[in-house]
Structures are given as structure tokens and as C-alpha cells.
Interface confidence: medium
Amino acid sequence: HKCDITLQEIIKTLNSLTEQKTLCTELTVTDIFAASKNTTEKETFCRAATVLRQFYSHHEKDTRCLGATAQQFHRHKQLIRFLKRLDRNLWGLAGLNSCPVKEANQSTLENFLERLKTIMREKYSKCSS
């Protein structure tokens, strides 16, 4: 069942992402969940992917995030790799070409990912029951 495979992959990636703090997980992103009423599930996934893409495009080479130690550098590279994987899977789940994201409320990346994990876990429990 395609839904399960994609969702499992997303949840697995989110678990990895939320396990470890890096220099840049406290940077802020647009909180698309703050005003998600009247928004379809596909739109939510599409907007989440857009926000993540904006984040890693902007911060992939950010010197603050890359850090000054080998460990910090490795953790940031890992973060970006996971975000790209998550972005790809969310686009697949959304099935939309693009979606608008209004620069409104802000959330830290780590809170954004935790919220997304909750939504995905809820979806998975419905999907598998």
C-alpha cells in the first residue's frame, strides 16, 4: 500500500530530524499550521514541502549552521540531507505542482518538524487501521 510506504519513510525521516539539535534547528520558518483551517491535506503537505525547501535553500551554506567543528559540519550536512528527503516525499504525497505560502506566523524549525510528525503519525494510524 503506497500510502504506508511513503508515510513510513516520512515518519522515519522526521524521527531522525527531531532526535538531534543542531546550530540551525532553532532558526525560524513560516508556521503553515497556525492557520490551516479550510486547507486540504494535500495543500498542507505541499506547503510544508515549500517551507522546508525555502529553509534548506537558504541555510544549506549558512556559515552559522555549518559550524566550526567537524561534528557540527557533519550534523548540519545530515540535517540538510534529511530535509531534502522529507521535501521529496511530501511533494510525492501532495501531488501538487505548487502552492502559496504566506509569510505570516513564525515557528522554529524544530517545532515545525514536531508538529509535522504529529500530523503524519495521526495519518498513519488512520491509514493502517
Epitope: 539539535k21 546550530l23 534547528t25 532553532e26 532558526l27 525560524t28 525555502q54 513564525q106 522554529t108
Partner: nanobody, 116 residues
């Protein structure tokens, strides 16, 4: 409204020390990573240091490593930058910063001049 107010800049001799402070308001300071950047005349903005909310993880540019120390007091909503062994090349306007989405929110800056 987010406000970042830097203080502590001034004129200092080479080898001297300064401590910069940044008073933050308008957001939950303890939840966010904060940092210092600087801009010397005719040069691009350079990240100097960054610190996560708990203070356990820090970043320093190679040019200041071992001389500058970033710290924060979450109970006072204040960010600090202790600058020791200052050099002429440290002369710049120092900005306190908070990341805001794809943009960074800056204070007005405080001028640090290292000269004999």
C-alpha cells in the same frame, strides 16, 4: 514587535577587551538561537558567532576563535559577546541578530574601533 538593542561598543587599544550586550524583546528569547555579525568598512557582513537557546552549542568564525566568547542569559533576555585580544581588523559595526524565516532580524549595531 521584535527589538534588539546592542551596547558596549567603543574605542579600544589593540590587545584590549570589550563586552558587547544585546537586550532582546518582543519574542520568547529563550526559544531561539541568537548571534553576532559584523561589518567592517567596505567589506561584506560576516557572521562572528552563534549560540543555540540552551547555550550548549556555539559557532565561531575562524578569525575570532579563541579570542571571542558568546554567551546568553535567558532570564535577562540578553546576549553577550566578550571580545579579548582585540586587533585592528576587528574594527567594525557589530550587530546582534535573530533569524526570522528566510531573513535575519538585526539590531541597529554598535561600533567597535580598535586603534592605538
Amino acid at each position: 514587535e521584535v527589538q534588539l538593542l546592542e551596547s558596549g561598543g567603543g574605542l579600544v587599544q589593540p590587545g584590549g577587551s570589550l563586552r558587547l550586550s544585546c537586550a532582546a524583546s518582543g519574542f520568547t528569547f529563550r526559544n531561539f538561537g541568537m548571534g553576532w555579525a559584523r561589518q567592517a568598512p567596505g567589506k561584506p557582513l560576516e557572521w562572528v558567532s552563534w549560540i543555540i537557546s540552551s547555550g550548549t552549542e556555539t559557532y565561531y568564525a575562524d578569525s575570532v576563535k579563541g579570542r571571542f566568547t558568546i554567551s546568553r542569559d535567558n532570564s535577562k533576555n540578553t546576549l553577550y559577546l566578550q571580545m579579548n585580544s582585540l586587533r585592528a581588523e576587528d574594527t567594525a559595526v557589530y550587530y546582534c541578530a535573530k533569524s526570522l524565516g528566510r531573513f535575519d532580524y538585526w539590531g541597529q549595531g554598535t561600533l567597535v574601533t580598535v586603534s592605538s
